[in-house]
């Protein structure tokens, strides 16, 4: 069942079917004998009770006040009264834009990230049984879609998808043709969730070591889920049996990003491990960033300024 009209302030476009549904509907059915009344007041005018005789455009059904269609002079305050229950709405009927397929003031804006799922479904549950056909327009040009009852777009968003999408439902009532338009302003934006991955610490690190001992080089980064972090060393990785890449550790940050850490373990350090670059790279769709480690014999550390050392 269609939910009730809970918003106290409503703006609608002239010339379209419209309805108000009060929010004690289930209760009203239980108390069939209770008097239920709809009133309108506009400006200085007192409450005027509404009934089908008030206007050929107005219809009353159970819990609903219908307009076929709503017009500019329907602007005003509406009341539903039943026993000690009252509901009030303020209705503002605005002019239709005659030069466009939609009225700018009646547009719902949506922001969709590029490559994220993007969906528009043309549905109108209240008038569903009366709708003959529905068309979907983009920037007022009709889109050719298979389903003319409920046209739908379901895809991964592209920048070209940006625009105004209007669902137009065509329906008959008492021999007259009406249409209801619902327009979405779709803005496609860059993937806001992605960050530029950052390698933590200095870009160049000299590590003081002793021959025959082991060392663990820790490479840490703040990155996106799909970003990769890896070590590069020597002519071809894996040529030195004393060098081992440990399993990457990942911890999710409160912001939904990842803190990754990858250790390169060098065992039984030899002369061949000294003064060569061990590069840690983080790669993302935005590119790469690299930080380098150089192993230096402890005896030689006096030759290098203290601030470049990593322990």
């Amino acid at each position: 069942a269609e939910s009730c009209t809970s918003r106290p302030h409503i703006t609608v476009v002239e010339g379209e079917p419209f309805y108000l549904k009060h929010c004690s509907c289930s209760l009203a059915h239980e108390i069939e004998t209770t008097t239920k009344s709809w009133y309108k007041s506009s400006g200085s005018q007192e409450h005027v009770e509404l009934n089908p005789r008030s206007s050929s455009r107005i219809a009353l059904h159970d819990c609903v006040l219908e307009f076929w269609p709503v017009e500019l002079n329907d602007t005003g305050s509406y009341f539903f009264q039943m026993k000690n229950y009252t509901q009030k709405w303020k209705l503002n009927v605005i002019r239709r834009n005659k030069h466009s397929c939609f009225t700018e003031r009646q547009v719902t804006s949506k922001i969709v990230e590029v490559k994220k799922f993007f969906q528009i479904t043309c549905e109108n549950s209240y008038y569903q049984t009366l709708v003959n056909s529905t068309s979907l327009y983009k920037n007022c040009k009709k889109l050719l879609l298979e389903n003319n009852k409920n046209p739908t777009i379901k895809k991964n968003a592209e920048f070209e998808d940006q625009g105004y999408y209007s669902c137009v439902h065509f329906l008959h009532h008492n021999g007259k043709l009406f249409n209801i338009t619902k327009t979405f302003n779709i803005t496609i934006v860059e993937d806001r969730s992605n960050i530029v991955p950052v390698l933590l610490g200095p870009k160049l690190n000299h590590v003081a070591v002793e021959l025959g001992k082991n060392v663990r080089l820790n490479c840490s980064a703040l990155l996106n889920e799909e970003d990769v972090i890896y070590w590069m060393f020597g002519e071809e990785n894996g040529s030195d049996p004393n060098i081992h890449e440990e399993k990457e550790m990942r911890i999710m940050t409160p912001e939904g990003k990842w803190h990754a850490s990858k250790v390169l373990r060098i065992e039984n350090i030899g002369e061949s491990n000294l003064n060569v670059l061990y590069n840690c790279t983080v790669a993302s769709t935005g590119g790469t960033d690299t930080k380098s480690f150089i192993l230096v014999r402890k005896a030689d550390m006096a030759d290098i300024p203290g601030h470049v050392f990593t322990r």
Epitope: V114, F159, E190, D191, N194, V196, E225, E226, V228, I229, Y230, K247, E248, R250, A260, A283, S284, T285, G286, G287, T288, D289, T290
Partner: antibody
Framework: QVQLVQSGAEVKKPGASVKVSCKAS????????ISWVRQAPGQGLEWMGW????????NYAQKHQGRVTMTTDTSTSTAYMELRSLRSDDTAVYYC????????WGRGTLVTVSS | DIVMTQSPDSLAVSLGERATINCKSS????????????LAWYQQKPGQPPKLLIY???TRESGVPDRFSGSGSGTDFTLTISSLQAEDVAVYYC?????????FGQGTKLEIK
Amino acid sequence: QVQLVQSGAEVKKPGASVKVSCKASGYTFTSYGISWVRQAPGQGLEWMGWISVYNGNTNYAQKHQGRVTMTTDTSTSTAYMELRSLRSDDTAVYYCARGWYFDLWGRGTLVTVSS
Amino acid sequence: DIVMTQSPDSLAVSLGERATINCKSSQTVLYSSNNKTYLAWYQQKPGQPPKLLIYWASTRESGVPDRFSGSGSGTDFTLTISSLQAEDVAVYYCQQYYRTPYTFGQGTKLEIK
């Protein structure tokens, strides 16, 4: 509109250099790396290298190391690929492409190396 | 470098029939830390730049018809066209973006039988 627009065809003599440009529009230029891919006549695709627009870092394929330079100008959202010491086997269509899976490509620039 | 090998080099399939192209990488392109597979498929028609069809091994690029699908993990991958259309005649390439240098397969030429 999201696009990569490349500079026009070039005819060069062996030993010369060529600089191909690739102007990006419709997206945030610094959010994606730019790769350069070439295709010799009737051949497959060859990745030459890429540049990280946000920090200027470059990765070149070993084959082109020392002969290729990739740069960007963020003020004009343009990427450049310069290839030096041209040889006849450098005759190819050179493409710029966005990201690490290449969801956006330039139309290509034909570079002909002939004496 | 990671070497990408496609098979077959060329393929002729009847209209409406299924076309299958294979791609093998010399080492894994599956990243255990996030369980993502760093493999893409492209379609290239004569005189045009390649067009991205599939990324992350199985995610269809927006606007690509659903007759195209990608599968596989680790080192063995497949591009399937469920019902071949005339406009699908092209050369198809796989590419890994797990490690630089990012490498392509040698290409598979798809024709109509």
